[in-house]
């Protein structure tokens, strides 16, 4: 059949070229005697301008001349046309005609519509509707422009070269013309938001298109943020766990929380624990989910920083049993925990394990125990637990004394240590006088009161018959114990008024009370520090003005015609008085610890006072040493020279100065003070910091040379100073030289010499040195 096939339309850009692909056909029985003439027309239905003529190129319209090329081969039925150096005016319809003979010829009336534009149209990007992480997809960039003479280039930009590849294809067929650049990409979540571009380069023009990738992917970077963090979480605190998702597309649709693998109710991104408790400790994870998939966070351990003590055995504990105390912490306790154990708030040494074992428990192990856990962030204590070791009663403690009420009352007190509580019974001569169970041989003179493991008996209107042996017995389910006591109903009691501690000069009254009724011929004996002080009928002894010599331990006895009381318990009288004049001595020891040890100055201040005084040693208005803070032993004075050693004791202050300097000589003041007054004493300290040396010897021959040098040990060593020189106690010379030279030595120079530095006020004179001059007898 007769026909021509070419694209419906072809597009081009000014200055570029285009190719119209074309094929034609004719019946097989048509003979071709002289070849086929191929003709392309522009505007066939109108101007019918010849664009290309295979037989007669001169027929080609001037404006197309040199710009068209018949690229076909009529013998092969191919009629491709190339249009170069395109101009917008080239737009229009192009039709192909082929001629075989006068009768066998064919014109294509349909033709191809050519559009030439000033600028290229932007390339078209085709993309899959849905982009999913993990899939491989193709992005197609296409343009209708094809020019075989020069490159029509499509270029992808913005892709990750490591995960993509591009390939190119051109469509050049009678059905259509086009250029395709395919970008094949393995989609990753990191491509989400990526800008992919395709650029078309044609002639000297460029055009771009782009797409903004929306890649669907499961949540990424899911982790739990714990607040507070970087410190211990304490019970009762607000704890917040936040499920943080680094990225997700589409957005996270649901969040699940798990604790120790068990799903929690919370569905939001934040898990609040308003008051952290033991049960909240554990391993938490969160799972974030979107339409694509889900991701579980790495587990986070939540430890509530607390402890509790568990005691085993749980029931009653008997002596010699082993008791185990375990310091428990909630789940997920960090490995760096250190443990300490306390009993009755006292730290137990060498107990640093999470278990405390009490082997062969004794009653001494009874008490309140708690443990303390500690790490780099802090420490926390458990609540206390009571450990009670059951045991039979120990020997009861039975005491008796007389108390002054309306007359004297005899009091007996019995207490015992036992677990469980014991029943206490007080008896005298076989009669039960009092019991913690309430049983007694009742007498109105006896009244008993009891507490846990304690029993008290009061005996009123004491009689001679109340004297004798009293017995206290204690019994519990594990055993019993007994104590006895000899009670003297006629024992005396000494009272000091107004107080046992008085200030010197105050009046003091000592009163002696006997357990028995007083008689007219009663006599009282008074003892001070065990020695009889006074005897007489008066039951009171008055000290009108107490002095320090009255202080001591007093007791008394009462005696009537036929009986005598026992001695009272001693009562101590303390008399407070201000410091007396301190005793302050200074001395210097030379070569104190053998040859070469040097000089050692000693300053010793003692005082008599009660309470002990605060002693202060002052030199040139500066405190050199003080007895505060109290505490024995010795130390170097704070801020003083390390050569100074201070020793403190009550009412004594001792200062030792090694190799005293000139500045440390002179007048020292010792001040003593307490709440009642103060006193002071001064003393001069000569540390022999100034030494006169005569060279070459103290004994010289007349006519030789003598050098007298004033050696001064001082802080300002080497600084200029003036010296005074004394000869036989009289000022002899003065000046800045520390050495005076006698040349020649005359017999008249024989004398007692001394020197002193003038720069230091109160500087001591050197020890005088005798210069002896030897000379021959006079003729």
């Amino acid at each position: 059949s007769w026909g021509v096939s070419s694209p419906q339309d072809v597009q081009g850009v000014k200055g570029s070229c285009l190719l119209i692909p074309c094929i034609f056909s004719f019946p097989a029985d048509v003979e071709v005697p002289d070849g086929i003439t191929a003709i392309w027309y522009y505007d066939y239905s109108g101007q019918r301008q010849v664009v290309s003529h295979s037989a007669d190129p001169k027929l080609v319209e001037a404006r197309f001349r040199g710009r068209t090329e018949f690229m076909g081969n009529p013998e092969h039925r191919v009629c491709n046309l190339l249009l170069k150096d395109l101009q917008p005016e080239d737009s229009g319809s192009y039709n192909f005609r082929f001629e075989i003979s006068e009768v066998n010829r064919w014109s294509d009336v349909k033709g191809t519509l050519v559009t030439v534009t000033e600028e290229p149209r932007v390339p078209t990007i085709a993309s899959p509707v849905e982009l999913l992480e993990g899939t491989e997809v193709d992005f197609n960039c296409s343009t209708p422009y094809v020019c075989l003479q020069e490159q029509v280039r499509l270029q992808w930009q913005g892709q990750d070269p490591a995960r993509s590849v591009t390939f190119n294809s051109q469509k050049f067929e009678p059905t259509g013309v086009g250029h395709l650049e395919t970008l094949h990409m393995a989609m990753s979540w990191q491509d989400h938001g990526r800008i992919l571009r395709c650029q078309l380069s044609v002639a000297n023009h460029r055009a771009q298109s782009e797409i903004h990738l929306q890649v669907k992917y499961a949540p990424k970077g899911v982790k739990i943020l714990l607040s507070p963090s970087g410190r211990n979480i304490l019970p009762g605190e607000l704890v917040t766990l936040t499920c943080q998702v680094n990225s997700s597309y589409p957005a996270v649709s649901s969040i699940k929380w798990l604790k120790d693998g068990v799903r929690l109710q919370t569905k939001t991104g934040v898990l609040h624990l308003p008051q952290a408790a033991w049960s909240d400790a554990g391993v938490y994870t969160c799972q974030a989910e979107n339409g694509v998939g889900s991701l579980v966070s790495p587990p986070i351990s939540l430890h509530i920083f607390m402890a509790e003590v568990q005691v085993s055995p749980a029931g009653p504990i008997l002596e010699n049993q082993t008791v185990t105390l375990v310091c428990n912490t909630p789940n997920e306790a960090p490995s760096d925990l250190r443990y300490s154990w306390y009993k009755n708030h006292v730290l137990l040494e060498d107990a640093h394990s999470h278990t405390l074992r009490l082997h062969l428990a004794t009653r001494a192990d009874t008490g309140f125990y708690f443990c303390e856990v500690q790490n780099v962030h802090g420490s926390e204590r458990s609540g206390p637990v009571s450990v009670v070791v059951n045991h039979p009663p120990l020997t009861p403690v039975l005491t008796a004394f007389l108390e002054t009420q309306a007359g004297l009352v005899g009091i007996l007190h019995c207490s015992v240590v036992s677990e469980p509580l014991a029943t206490l019974v007080l008896s005298h001569g076989g009669h039960i006088l009092a019991s913690t169970s309430g049983d007694s041989d009742h007498s109105p003179r006896f009244s008993g009161t009891s507490g846990p493991n304690s029993l008290r008996l009061e005996i009123r209107d004491l009689e001679e018959t109340d004297s004798g042996e009293y017995k206290c017995s204690a019994t519990n389910s594990l055993g019993n114990a007994t104590s006895t006591l000899d009670f003297h109903a006629n024992a005396a009691r000494l009272l000091i008024s107004p107080a046992a501690e008085v200030v010197e000069g105050q009046a003091v009254t000592l009163s002696c009370r006997s357990g028995l009724s007083p008689t007219p011929d009663a006599r009282f004996s008074w003892y001070l520090n065990g020695a009889l002080l006074h005897e007489g009928p008066g039951s009171s002894l008055l000290l009108p003005a107490a002095s320090s010599t009255d202080a001591g331990s007093y007791h008394c006895r009462a005696r009537d015609g036929h009986s005598a009381s026992g001695p009272s318990s001693p009562a101590v009288l303390t008399v407070l008085y201000p410091p007396r004049q301190p005793t302050f001595t200074t001395r210097l020891d030379l070569d104190a610890a053998g040859a070469g040890a040097g000089r050692r100055g000693l300053l010793l201040c003692r005082v008599d006072s009660d309470p002990p005084a605060r002693l202060q040693l002052l030199h040139k208005d500066r405190v050199v040493a003080t007895s505060l803070p109290s505490g024995g032993g010795c130390s170097t004075c704070g801020g003083c020279s390390p050569r100074m050693k201070v020793t403190k004791a009550p009412n004594l202050l001792r200062v030792e100065i090694h190799n005293p300097l000139l500045e440390e000589e002179g007048l020292y003041l010792c001040e003593a003070s307490n709440a009642l007054g103060n006193a002071s004493t001064s003393a001069t300290f000569n540390g022999q910091a100034t030494v006169l040396a005569i060279a070459p010897s103290h004994t010289l021959q007349e006519g030789t040379e003598a050098n007298l040098t004033c050696n001064v040990s001082r802080e300002a060593a080497g600084s200029p100073a003036n010296f005074s020189w004394f000869r036989n106690g009289v000022l002899w010379a003065q000046g800045p030289l520390e050495t005076v030279t006698l040349l020649p030595v005359a017999r008249t120079d024989a004398a007692l010499y001394a020197c002193r530095i003038l720069t230091e006020a109160g500087a001591q004179l050197s020890t005088p040195v005798l210069l002896s001059v030897l000379y021959p007898p006079d003729r």
């Epitope: 932007v122 938001g193 990526r194 571009r197 650029q199 055009a207 298109s209």
Partner: antibody, heavy 119, light 108 residues
Amino acid sequence: QVQLQQPGAELVKPGASVKLSCMASGYIFTNYWMHWVKQRPGRGLEWIGRIDPNSAGTKYNDNFKNKATLTVDKSSKTSYMQLNSLTSADSAVYFCAREDFDSRNFDVWGTGTTVTVSS
Amino acid sequence: ENVLTQSPAIMSASPGEKITMTCRATSSVSSSYLHWFQQKSGASPKPWIYSTSNLASGVPARFSGSGSGTSYSLTISSVEAEDAATYYCQQYSGYPLTFGGGTKVEIK
């Protein structure tokens, strides 16, 4: 040489609109996309959007979608940005900038137009 | 939105000193699309470094850029008086395009 010329200043009343121009020279206008950038006094740079002079296709920063409209006139090689419903927050220097396709770099910047919104 | 944070905001240097400023992104940026601009007072920004490490035309060799992912930097090996300006980083890896807050370089 390549240049982007912008008017020096525009004074507008609150609530009014203003159309800023950016005239290109020295290159093929349609070959390069044009971007617009805002800079408030003493502040940093803020991207408004871009236009393809060839296709007139645009892309906007969400923050300026209801504020700016980008257009081009290929014949005069001019890019325009219209700003509407002006307030004092719109007082700023507005720059146009050409984008180099290969590096996506703003390789040429306009001289900038100072917009003052005041009654 | 990929937020770019520049630090320090202001830096003072003596001539001859070496200085480095950083630009951190909240999301990864392709090194091909991370650029730096220089802006002097009252002037338009100038392209300074493009695609992380390429110097724009006319930029002295004492400037250099480096980085990848979310961390980028601009270094001046030996500061000169003419380098006093504000330097902005910018990303074109995703929309919206974003700029850093700028680092102002002052010369003592």
